[in-house]
């Protein structure tokens, strides 16, 4: 004959454990039902009555089968530098992740505790390692033959255009200026040019008609008295 199915609460056989979704109540010394996700134990079981479960209140949750007396509080609302990627429900906590242009500088079990803006590389520097959800951008000086004239968390160093006749040689922060109407060729616009490992040498020293006209890192950028538009910190 098949063994009879025991209904909770029941006393377990010596040496055995309670079944799945049951827990052993030390006071009652019985196997009792757990509450499902989204619920909590309102009344604990006795020798004669099973656990009484109740739904979690607003802004509280339980994610697992449980016998906790109170549901867990959902985390605080996401800050302005975060987006809510998972809402607070009776069965799950709110999850906040960093909004685009930011990365997680201090993570927690789920989501992010502290977001920080991605580093922006200034002219003469390009993105050598892009930012991710959990790591900042790494900027590197543009190698000879490449330049970046922007302050950006995404722009890489791009190759100088090749001129028939050079009017102004390029440098780390400025493209070459050609005297002819069009360059003989320009590298593919999508080509990635990260700094190359080279032996120690002086940066940006290219043959130029007049070295004094091509300083090591010069810029052609618009002037203006207004603060930079990248954010309140200018960074």
């Amino acid at each position: 004959l098949p063994a009879q199915v025991a209904f909770t609460p029941y006393a377990p056989e010596p040496g055995s454990t309670c079944r799945l979704r049951e827990y052993y109540d030390q006071t009652a010394q019985m196997c009792c039902s757990k509450c499902s996700p989204g619920q909590h134990a309102k009344v604990f079981c006795t020798k004669t009555s099973d656990t009484v479960c109740d739904s979690c209140e607003d802004s509280t949750y339980t994610q697992l089968w449980n016998w906790v007396p109170e549901c867990l509080s959902c985390g605080s609302r996401c800050s302005s530098d975060q987006v809510e990627t998972q809402a607070c429900t009776r069965e799950q906590n709110r999850i906040c992740t960093c909004r685009p242009g930011w990365y997680c500088a201090l993570s927690k079990q789920e989501g992010c505790r502290l977001c920080a803006p991605l580093r922006k590389c200034r002219p003469g520097f390009g993105v050598a390692r892009p930012g991710t959800e959990t790591s900042d951008v790494v900027c590197k000086p543009c190698a000879p033959g490449t330049f970046s004239n922007t302050t950006s968390s995404t722009d890489i160093c791009r190759p100088h255009q090749i001129c028939n006749v050079v009017a102004i040689p390029g440098n780390a922060s400025m493209d070459a200026v050609c005297t002819s109407t069009s360059p003989t060729r320009s590298m593919a616009p999508g080509a990635v040019h990260l700094p190359q490992p080279v032996s120690t040498r002086s940066q940006h020293t290219q043959p130029t008609p007049e070295p004094s006209t091509a300083p090591s890192t010069s810029f052609l950028l618009p002037m203006g008295p207004s603060p930079p538009a990248e954010g309140s910190t200018g960074d």
Partner: antibody
Framework: QVQLVQSGAEVKKPGASVKVSCKAS????????IHWVRQAPGQGLEWMGW????????DYADKFKKRVTMTADTSISTAFMELSRLRSDDTAVYYC????????????WGQGTLVTVSS | DIQMTQSPSSLSASVGDRVTITCQGS??????LAWFQQKPGKAPKLLIY???SLQTGVPSRFSGSRSGTDFTLTISSLQPEDFATYFC????????FGGGTKLELK
């Protein structure tokens, strides 16, 4: 916390060379370039050059191009600045400073190394 | 090379005074100008970068501004710990420090 710790004071004869070290801690050494800046007694600050520890790329001020060599050893997170053919007017405090290539420039400095050139 | 002309070279002031130090670039340097504070026997300390941006931990009495190629560091109300030497630094076209301004107690 971020720290740049430099080697101790040096006394050198004219014509000799000096090598100053700058040990970095508290951040990823290869993610920042290291600048070297000097300051003669009672004078202003003078930029000498930078090194990218990752690749060894350098950029030197014209004034120092023929006499300075900047290197780095990533295994010990240390940058070095060697100045050769020393003259009495090279007597100065030499500083290292880090730079991440963002608009936030030279946000951490070493304590400085006094180099005295005297016969 | 771009030259940075800093003025005045020295300045006497009292606690509570409003003080301005000016740096003029010989060419356009966009907003790539920083201000450093240096006390005797110490390394320089970054106060302001990108012309306007206050470095973390620097008191809000320090501020930076710009008009064309003229850049200004303002200390709104001098505190005893502010007496030091201040340097501007351009990092747009190469790298160049201004000559410095020694701020002394009147």
């Amino acid at each position: 916390q971020v720290q740049l710790v430099q080697s101790g004071a040096e006394v050198k004869k004219p014509g000799a060379s000096v090598k100053v070290s700058c040990k970095a801690s508290g951040y990823t050494f290869t993610d920042y370039i290291i600048h070297w800046v000097r300051q003669a007694p009672g004078q202003g600050l003078e930029w000498m050059g930078w090194i990218d520890p990752d690749y060894g790329n350098t950029d030197y001020a014209d004034k120092f191009k023929k006499r300075v060599t900047m290197t780095a050893d990533t295994s010990i997170s240390t940058a070095f600045m060697e100045l050769s053919r020393l003259r009495s007017d090279d007597t100065a405090v030499y500083y290292c400073a880090r730079d991440d290539g963002s608009p936030l420039v030279m946000d951490a400095w070493g304590q400085g190394t006094l180099v005295t050139v005297s016969s | 090379d771009i030259q940075m002309t800093q003025s005045p070279s020295s300045l006497s002031a009292s606690v509570g005074d409003r003080v301005t130090i000016t740096c003029q670039g010989s060419q356009n340097i966009d907003n790539y100008l920083a201000w450093f504070q240096q006390k005797p026997g110490k390394a320089p300390k970054l106060l302001i970068y990108s012309t306007y941006s206050l470095q973390t931990g620097v008191p809000s009495r320090f501020s930076g501004s710009r008009s064309g190629t003229d850049f200004t560091l303002t200390i709104s109300s001098l505190q005893p710990e502010d007496f030091a030497t201040y340097f501007c630094f351009q990092y747009n076209n190469g790298y160049m420090f201004g000559g410095g301004t020694k701020l002394e107690l009147k």
